[in-house]
């Protein structure tokens, strides 16, 4: 089949994920285009283990994750349900905050240097993580 | 050795439809973005779509968008272009080409040889 | 969509001549940039990508520079088999995008 089993050259497998990190910026909408088109989405963050490992590999740097409310309510991704999954925002974020002068609000969500996370405009070139999941089916024992 | 192979071009009727396919060797194919890039006679180079190594995402230049739908059958390392509703704008060589992802980009390398594809009013 | 200008549309050089083509974004693309040769009844060739890093193979005469908006292929001292034509292309988003082309013909 065609169910990846290891990671790509250059990604990094962390729990049955691969993770890639950029070095460069993107807006958002074309770090999600990138990750698409390597059969993965932007990062989607589910515990505080997730949180730690992605924090760990990106360091104190602006990084794009799979979060955004550009729709309305906020939305991973992958469907991974927002209300009742793991959240890292910051003191009093997100805000939507309109005082940035570039128009409208802020619908994409990033970690920032201390791996909290902030709502911002979605234009702005920050460096981004992809993430795709192992095949599935070779987490489970082989026949005997 | 990497290479492609394209197959399918010719002679289409304007409002007509047109298959091609390109046939692929030489690596991983089904882990492998690709994508069609065209160029008109005399002219510049097109971006035409590109799709995922699954063939789960897809992407379009708006100039054949809801016209055109590349798919893939990794079960045969084949790539196709299905080219519908075709005017003489979309008279051009068309080639098929690998996917590379380097430093946060995409870029092509290599190419296939070519197919023409030529549209009669 | 970013529009990518190149020029010249066409130079004329000589063997062992210096020739240097520009490539300008209509936005910025840090350094998600490409240069490809095409040779005439030929597919194109990736020369460079990522701006600035030569694709295996390729001649160390050929050399890029540049990121954001502005963008220059070098070639140090040009050689009979460098006769042809040169496409930039960006990378940063969806279109992506090719220059028009600048050829480089025989003075």
């Known amino acids: 089949g065609s169910e990846r089993t290891c990671c790509p050259v250059n990604w990094v497998e962390h729990e049955r994920s691969c993770y890639w990190f950029s070095r460069s910026g993107k807006a958002w909408a074309d770090a999600d285009n990138y990750c698409r088109l390597e059969d993965a989405h932007l990062v989607v963050v589910t515990s505080w283990e997730e949180q730690k490992f992605v924090q760990h590999h990106i360091g104190p740097v602006n990084t794009w994750m799979g979060l955004h409310d550009q729709n309305g309510p906020w939305k991973w991704v992958d469907g991974t349900d927002y209300e009742t999954g793991f959240k890292n925002w910051r003191p009093e974020q997100p805000d939507d905050w309109y005082g940035h002068g570039l128009g409208g609000g802020e619908d994409c969500a990033h970690f920032t240097d201390d791996g909290r996370w902030n709502d911002d405009v979605c234009q702005r070139p920050y460096r981004w993580v992809c993430e795709t999941e192992l095949d599935k089916a070779s987490q489970e024992p082989p026949l005997l | 050795e990497v290479q492609m192979l394209e197959s399918g071009g010719g002679l289409g009727q304007s409002g007509g439809s047109l298959r091609l396919s390109c046939t692929a060797s030489?690596?991983?194919?089904?882990?492998?973005?690709m994508s069609w890039v065209r160029q008109a006679p005399g002219k510049g180079l097109e971006w035409v779509s590109a799709?995922?190594?699954?063939?789960?995402?897809?992407f379009y230049a708006d100039s054949v968008k809801g016209r055109f739908t590349v798919t893939r059958d990794n079960s045969k390392n084949t790539l196709y272009l299905q080219m519908n509703s075709l005017t003489a704008e979309d008279t051009a060589v068309y080639y098929c080409?690998?996917?590379?992802?380097?430093?946060?980009?995409?870029?092509?390398?290599?190419w296939g040889q070519g197919t023409l594809v030529t549209v009669s009013s | 969509d970013i529009q990518m200008t190149q020029s010249p549309s066409s130079v004329y050089a000589s063997v062992g001549d210096r020739v240097t083509i520009t490539c300008r974004a209509s936005?910025?693309?840090?350094?998600?940039l490409a240069w490809y040769q095409q040779k005439p009844g030929k597919a194109p060739k990736l020369l460079i990508y990522?701006?600035?890093s030569l694709q295996s193979g390729v001649p160390s005469r050929f050399s890029g520079s540049g990121s954001g908006t502005d963008f220059t292929l070098t070639i140090s001292s040009l050689q009979p088999e460098d006769f042809a034509t040169y496409y930039c292309?960006?990378?940063?988003?969806?279109?992506?995008?090719f220059g028009g082309g600048t050829k480089v013909e025989i003075k």
């Open positions: 030489g690596f991983t194919f089904t882990t492998s973005a």
């Open positions: 292309q960006q990378a940063n988003s969806f279109p992506l995008t």
């Open positions: 799709i995922s190594g699954s063939g789960a995402n897809t």
């Open positions: 990522a701006a600035s």
């Open positions: 936005q910025g693309i840090s350094s998600y």
């Open positions: 080409v690998k996917v590379i992802a380097v430093a946060g980009g995409h870029f092509f390398d290599p």
